[in-house]
């Protein structure tokens, strides 16, 4: 059994999250994850989910009673999602920490927008780029 | 030329983001994107970048002078990053809108944590799962 399982059960007790009523009104993440089988689509969704958990854990960082559980789960997330790669984790953390209300950050983001956009679609790296762009013009929602 | 280019240039003027000093102290996104060649790694990073831009655009939704530019860019982001797939975009938006301070959301998130974690590594979806779990005991990052 992975180390996170026991610690997640501990968090369930702490958050009173074991009751069946918690599942009322559908799931947060599981239903969405079920929709996406493609690895790259899953990474798009999981990126948001992982950043949510890291934010949640940050909010409880001073609560000693769950510290060990939180640290163990974070460690296992780093192993599983970032493949134990600290550079990947650090780059991710930088992105999640940028403040959208900081004027300098806003200016930089707009300054970089054209280049970011050019790299957004997987096709951006291949010769298929131009043709797929033209298809989109004619049948915008066909994908 | 893609429609977003002209509109992004318009935003650059609005945000005074065309000056060379904007590039001081390094980039926000471009340096990070340069580090990751693997498509799934790129999606992890781009997911955070795209959510940043959507948040930024939301903050300026009442500014009529850039409305057309923002809408054009958002539409092109939906084409490029979400492959024109509205369901993908909607699921993404749901994830970005969950409030980390909402008690019900917290309980649900903790309730789903074990299953979310089980799906985090790419091996989780394949027949390799059981065997890789055992390999992980010996060499956790072997996948």
């Amino acid at each position: 059994q992975d180390p996170y399982v026991k610690e997640a059960e501990n968090l369930k007790k702490y958050f009173n999250a074991g009751h069946s009523d918690v599942a009322d009104n559908g799931t947060l993440f599981l239903g969405i994850l079920k929709n996406w089988k493609e690895e790259s689509d899953r990474k798009i969704m999981q990126s948001q989910i992982v950043s949510f958990y890291f934010k949640l854990f940050k909010n409880f960082k001073d609560d000693q009673s769950i510290q060990k559980s939180v640290e163990t789960i974070k460690e296992d997330m780093n192993v599983k999602f970032f493949n134990s790669n600290k550079k990947k984790r650090d780059d991710f953390e930088k992105l999640t920490n940028y403040s959208v209300t900081d004027l300098n950050v806003q200016r930089k983001a707009i300054h970089e927008l054209i280049q970011v956009m050019a790299e957004l679609s997987p096709a951006a790296k291949t010769g298929k780029r131009k043709r797929s762009q033209m298809l989109f013009r004619g049948r915008r929602a066909s994908q | 030329q893609d429609p977003y280019v002209k509109e992004a240039e318009n935003l650059k003027k609005y945000f005074n983001a065309g000056h060379s000093d904007v590039a001081d102290n390094g980039t926000l996104f471009l340096g990070i994107l340069k580090n990751w060649k693997e498509e799934s790694d790129r999606k992890i990073m781009q997911s955070q970048i795209v959510s940043f831009y959507f948040k930024l655009f939301k903050n300026f939704k009442d500014d009529q002078s850039i409305q057309k530019s923002v809408e054009t860019i958002k539409e092109d982001m939906n084409v490029k990053f979400f492959n024109s797939n509205k369901k993908k975009r909607d699921d993404f938006e749901k994830l970005t809108n969950y409030s980390v301070t909402d008690l019900n959301v917290q309980r649900k998130a903790i309730h789903e944590l074990i299953q979310v974690m089980a799906e985090l590594s790419p091996a989780a979806k394949t027949g390799k799962r059981k065997r890789s779990q055992m390999l992980f005991r010996g060499r956790r990052a072997s996948q």
Epitope: E71, T72, E75, N78, K86, K87, K88 | N35, R139, R140
Partner: antibody, heavy 120, light 111 residues
Framework: EVQLLESGGGLVQPGGSLRLSCAAS????????MSWVRQAPGKGLEWVSA????????YYADSVKGRFTISRDNSKNTLYLQMNSLRAEDTAVYYC?????????????WGRGTTVTVSS | NFMLTQPHSVSESPGKTVTISCTRS????????VQWYQQRPGSSPTTVIF?????PSGVPDRFSGSIDTSSNSASLTISGLKTEDEADYYC??????????FGGGTKLTVL
């Protein structure tokens, strides 16, 4: 001040076993991954194994996989390396090293090393 | 698996600048952090650069690290060379499964 003190080295015959220990102090032991790195006489550094802060994740070089086992006791601030089926090519100084992060990430502090000699 | 290739030895005079390269044979040099370790004769290694270009406290700013994606290599630069810099220098990074890889080491001689 960070201190790492290795012990347990010595002379052993091929096929034999040894258990190395590394006593750590001066930092929150469970918050950092730990590694074993070795250096054969007159040769370069060779990474052997690493273990995450909780002990939940372990990593091994191909040359030792299946023969060596890394473990840690966070209550005792101690790192271990159980070495079985030893070979002549395992002869080296074995360094215990503290990593920068909770998962293997490069080392910021190294012990003085303990010498393992495998010979008949 | 990839290799990290370093020059076997380099030499330079005191006060000068020397650069030691570390070339990754496959996979991107940028996809994992690179560390540099100094090992003086008869001593344990010490870290002079971590996470591509960061210096641990106590390491003088004469030591700097960089990575170059075009040559897929990392570099350690030591300026204002001193005799005490004479040592073996090792670069280190990780493969895609996060197993640790060391370069073969470079013997720096200060003439």
């Amino acid at each position: 001040e960070v201190q790492l003190l290795e012990s347990g080295g010595g002379l052993v015959q091929p096929g034999g076993s040894l258990r190395l220990s590394c006593a750590a102090s001066g930092f929150t032991f469970s918050s950092y991954a730990m590694s074993w790195v070795r250096q054969a006489p007159g040769k370069g550094l060779e990474w052997v194994s690493a273990i995450s802060g909780s002990g939940g994740s372990t990593y091994y070089a191909d040359s030792v996989k299946g023969r060596f086992t890394i473990s840690r006791d966070n209550s005792k601030n101690t790192l271990y390396l159980q070495m079985n089926s030893l070979r002549a090519e395992d002869t080296a100084v074995y360094y215990c090293a503290k990593d920068f992060w909770v998962i293997t990430s490069g080392n910021d502090y190294w012990g003085r090393g303990t010498t393992v000699t495998v010979s008949s | 698996n990839f290799m990290l290739t370093q020059p076997h030895s380099v030499s330079e005079s005191p006060g000068k600048t020397v650069t030691i390269s570390c070339t990754r044979s496959s996979g991107s040099i940028a996809s994992n952090y690179v560390q540099w370790y100094q090992q003086r004769p008869g001593s344990s290694p010490t870290t002079v650069i971590f996470e591509d270009n960061r210096r641990p406290s106590g390491v003088p700013d004469r030591f700097s690290g960089s990575i170059d994606t075009s040559s897929n290599s990392a570099s350690l630069t030591i300026s204002g060379l001193k005799t005490e810099d004479e040592a073996d220098y090792y670069c280190q990074s990780f493969d895609s499964t996060n197993l640790v890889v060391f370069g073969g080491g470079t013997k720096l001689t200060v003439l």
